[in-house]
């Protein structure tokens, strides 16, 4: 008799999830000598332990504590790049500017990037059919709680000048409901962080507007200023040229505005 299974509104666990996490862990620890001490089997066991046999709408930050302990990693606190709704460009940037880090450049972020996972209450099975959607089902699901936990710690780690890349093509350039807007902004520590510098990335080639004057950017400035952190904003009119100039800063065309 087939067992009744909860149907959630979101996609199910990414296929080959255990193998993917383990393989990513091995690859990461091979590339990053400072993380060679990490036992990837223990990392997978801790990851699995956070959600297996638990109701996927009842996950807590404490569930991820063993994984977070194993994934402890020092990042240069003054080289942190946050992003919102523009992950690909942020990652392209840190692949070129190797001394700067997004969350996905850390072990924990790298393990989980673009993956979905959930289990079922009282069974050791991974649910490959469906997982809870943050809006339609519940917010305390395994994926959302994971990103909230690691994003909070990442923001808390930051110091000096923190950069954030924002998508200027979206109706809400700064979105209070994004992970950046709801978690990271509120966990930057004013005693450590002097300035948040926003880079607003333009989409259209002929878009010469000053998107730093956008109402949502003014809202971000207000939130940050109230937290006793300075705010600055730059338009990146040509993201392709911006990346090119990060690669080749001596290029004569890189002295003009990008």
């Amino acid at each position: 008799v087939p067992r009744w299974r909860q149907q959630w509104s979101g996609p199910g666990t990414t296929k080959r999830f255990p193998e993917t996490v383990l393989a990513r862990c091995v690859k990461y620890t091979e590339i990053h000598p400072e993380m060679r001490h990490v036992d990837c089997q223990s990392v997978w066991d801790a990851f699995k332990g956070a959600f297996i046999s638990k109701h996927p709408c009842n996950i807590t930050e404490e569930d991820y504590q063993p994984l977070m302990k194993l994934g402890t990693q020092t990042v240069p606190c003054n080289k942190i790049l946050l992003w919102s709704r523009i992950k690909d460009l942020a990652h392209q940037f840190t692949q070129v500017q190797r001394d700067m880090f997004t969350l996905e450049d850390t072990l924990l972020g790298y393990l989980a990037d673009d993956l979905t996972w959930c289990g079922e209450f009282n069974t050791s099975k991974i649910n490959y059919q469906s997982c809870p959607d943050w809006r339609k089902d519940c917010s305390n699901n395994p994926v959302s709680v994971f990103w909230k936990t690691v994003s909070r710690r990442f923001a808390e780690a930051a110091c000096d000048v923190v950069h954030v890349m924002l998508n200027g093509s979206r109706s809400k350039i700064f979105d209070k409901n994004s992970t950046f807007g709801s978690v990271e902004v509120h966990n930057l520590q004013p005693e450590k962080v002097q300035t948040l510098e926003a880079w607003v990335i333009h989409g259209g080639r002929e878009d010469s507007r000053d998107l730093c004057q956008d109402p949502t950017i003014k809202e971000l400035e207000s939130i940050i200023s109230k937290r006793n952190i300075q705010f600055s904003c730059k338009n990146i009119y040509r993201p392709d040229k911006f990346l090119q100039c990060v690669k080749n800063p001596e290029d004569s065309s890189c002295t003009s505005e990008i």
Epitope: G71, G109, C159
Partner: nanobody, 124 residues
């Protein structure tokens, strides 16, 4: 709950070495669960990180102070200490010891726990 308490002289002469100790209670300085550091706040200025020390003994120092700073751990007394050599009046500040949880991504600046602070004046 982890608690930290700074101790040391409140007055140091120019060119001498400032020495401070931080006594930890509620946790072990040798535990892999924490990392430790020193922070200071000169009068009217922002807090600045002096340096930090991690489980296993690796250290990070503020580049502007690096040549003058030593941070060490004494596991028998459950303490860690700061030595800052060749001090000048610019080193007058409130000095804080601090601790951080080794939990996920962490920076060089521990900020999960902090002592009350001790004022050190550099003057002859």
């Amino acid at each position: 709950q982890l608690q930290l308490q700074e101790s040391g002289p409140g007055l140091v002469k120019p060119s001498e070495t400032l020495s401070l100790t931080c006594t930890v209670s509620g946790g072990s300085v040798s535990s892999s669960s924490y990392y430790w550091g020193w922070i200071r706040q000169p009068p009217g200025k922002r807090l600045e990180l002096i340096g930090s020390i991690y489980y296993g003994g690796s250290t990070y120092f503020n580049p502007s102070l690096k040549s003058r700073v030593t941070i060490s751990v004494d596991t028998s007394k459950n303490q860690f200490s700061l030595k800052l050599s060749s001090v000048t009046a610019a080193d007058t500040a409130v000095y804080y010891c601090a601790g951080g949880d080794t939990y996920g991504p962490v920076g060089q600046w521990p900020s999960d726990y902090r002592g009350q602070g001790t004022l050190v004046t550099v003057s002859s």
